[in-house]
């Protein structure tokens, strides 16, 4: 852009330098030239002379009109005509912008991941503004009414040592440009009620060898939270659908859990857990693969109508993906939920 | 209540420094945004620099390169060093808290008198 440039003259624009994407505007050139009667004044947009709606105001001062501007940045400058000089004489040049008010930020909310010492807030910007936009976290505490506040642009992390005075906060995000300022909802947040636990991690898998095999997914967490609730899913690799099962675990020891699958197939497995009783959840833990060993007898038998099932607390359900490259987005396939697990072995799936 | 106090103002030539402090009282300073601003004779206020309650500092076009704003949590003191001074830098500079934008700083104190002349 034009930062620092040496006019002699003056350029202005109305409505403004950052205006409304859409308006339209008049860009005003002055010429203020020692020894020089401009025969012409002219207009650039990007260093591109302008050929239309330019008007000669007086013998000073012209004037370019954009209808419905909508780009959102420009360089423009303008020049002098002036007899005897072969070259035009540059005036005055003004970067200008257009962009949109800021919608008001939606969707806040606020984590903290188990040993970082950190609270994350994240939100949701809305539409482009295509200007310089602020956003401001202001995070109130509920006992002392001391409000802190933060800049940042669409998530900020802000280190619990710096709440250590209240467990109750009132946190909201404030967008600001020069088009216009909103406010996000106000979110009460309890630092106890918003701790993610540390990251599950499944280790190993295996295959038993029985008449029929079981497959045990061992898996672990760092988690210093006591009662923990979790969500293992899988599928085929060939499958869109993925079976969740629900688990109680206590982390104090690897989890083992077993599982009654197809044999000779390639599973994706995957955990995610959350405080018991609380509403945020782990991101889903990375994919483990694991394949199925090859099937001894003649059998083709079906998991879902397998006569190993019995009715227990667990909880298994169908969820598919939209995408197979996507399968970290799921959904709800059902409001079908088969409760079942395995009659034989020793049930280890709940901690 | 909130209480600031600034100090450090005088008179300076164009390319002489100067340092501003900001004397605050009633509020936990450490975990608080602070912003100082400025009233040119004649004018509104324009904020000048802010630093949020993270310590992300923030610069007006205008001093960015030349003005450098920071707290010292230990003297409950906000301090603004203005390098390569300008006459348009001329004004009487407040202290306040809260960050620049949206509505939310507010300022207490008297304020501090510079004046940039050869």
């Known amino acids: 852009g034009i930062t620092s440039i040496n006019c002699s003259g003056d350029m202005w624009v109305e409505p403004g330098e950052i205006f409304q994407m859409g308006m339209n505007v008049s860009i005003y050139c002055q010429e203020a030239l020692k020894h020089c009667r401009p025969r012409n004044l002219y207009f650039y947009k990007n260093g591109f002379k302008e050929e239309f709606d330019i008007t000669r105001i007086n013998r000073t001062t012209a004037r370019i009109w954009y209808k419905g501007f909508s780009e959102p940045h420009a360089y423009m400058h303008c020049t002098a005509e002036c007899p005897g000089h072969f070259q035009e004489t540059l005036i005055c040049g003004k970067d200008i912008s257009s962009g949109h008010p800021p919608d008001a930020p939606s969707n806040l909310t606020c984590v903290i991941y188990e040993y970082s010492g950190n609270m994350t807030c994240t939100w949701n910007t809305g539409k482009p503004t295509y200007i310089d936009t602020k956003y401001i976290v202001h995070v109130k505490s509920l006992e002392t009414e001391e409000e802190q506040q933060y800049l940042a642009s669409s998530y900020v992390k802000i280190s619990t040592d710096s709440l250590q005075g209240s467990r109750k906060y009132l946190v909201w995000v404030q967008a600001v440009n020069s088009l216009g300022m909103e406010n996000s909802q106000q979110l009460h947040v309890h630092l106890d009620d918003i701790v993610i636990p540390s990251a599950s991690i499944i280790s190993r898998a295996e295959t038993t060898n029985d008449t029929v095999p079981k497959t045990i997914v061992y898996w672990k967490s760092k988690t210093m939270i006591e009662k923990v609730f979790c969500e293992m899913r899988y599928k085929t690799t060939t499958n869109q659908t993925w079976s969740v099962k629900e688990f109680d675990a206590n982390f104090t020891y690897v989890q083992q859990s077993e599982f009654y699958l197809e044999p000779d197939s390639k599973y994706v497995f995957q955990v995610r857990c959350q405080e018991t009783g609380k509403r945020n959840w782990q991101p889903w833990s990375s994919p483990f693969v694991h394949q199925t060993s090859q099937e001894t007898g003649k059998r083709n038998w079906q998991p879902w109508s397998s006569p190993f099932v019995h009715q227990t607390s667990q909880t298994v359900s169908q969820v598919t993906a939209k995408s197979s490259h996507e399968p970290q987005k799921m959904e709800m396939l059902s409001a079908t939920i088969f409760r079942g697990h395995p009659a034989s072995g020793n049930h280890q799936d709940i901690g | 209540q909130v209480q600031l106090q600034e100090s450090g103002g005088g008179l300076v030539q164009p390319g002489g420094s100067l340092r501003l402090s900001c004397a605050t009282s009633g509020f936990t300073f450490s975990s608080g945004a602070m912003t100082w601003v400025r009233q040119a004779p004649g004018k509104g206020l324009d904020w000048v620099s802010g630093?949020?309650?993270?310590?992300?500092?923030v610069y007006a076009d205008s001093v960015k390169g030349r003005f450098t704003i920071s707290k010292d949590n230990a003297k409950n003191t906000l301090y603004l060093q203005m390098n390569s001074l300008k006459t348009e830098d001329t004004a009487v500079y407040y202290c306040?808290?809260?960050?620049?934008?949206?509505?939310?700083?507010?300022?207490t104190g008297q304020g501090t008198q510079v004046t940039v002349s050869s």
């Open positions: 306040a808290t809260g960050l620049p934008w949206g509505n939310t700083w507010r300022t």
């Open positions: 630093i949020d309650s993270g310590g992300t500092t």
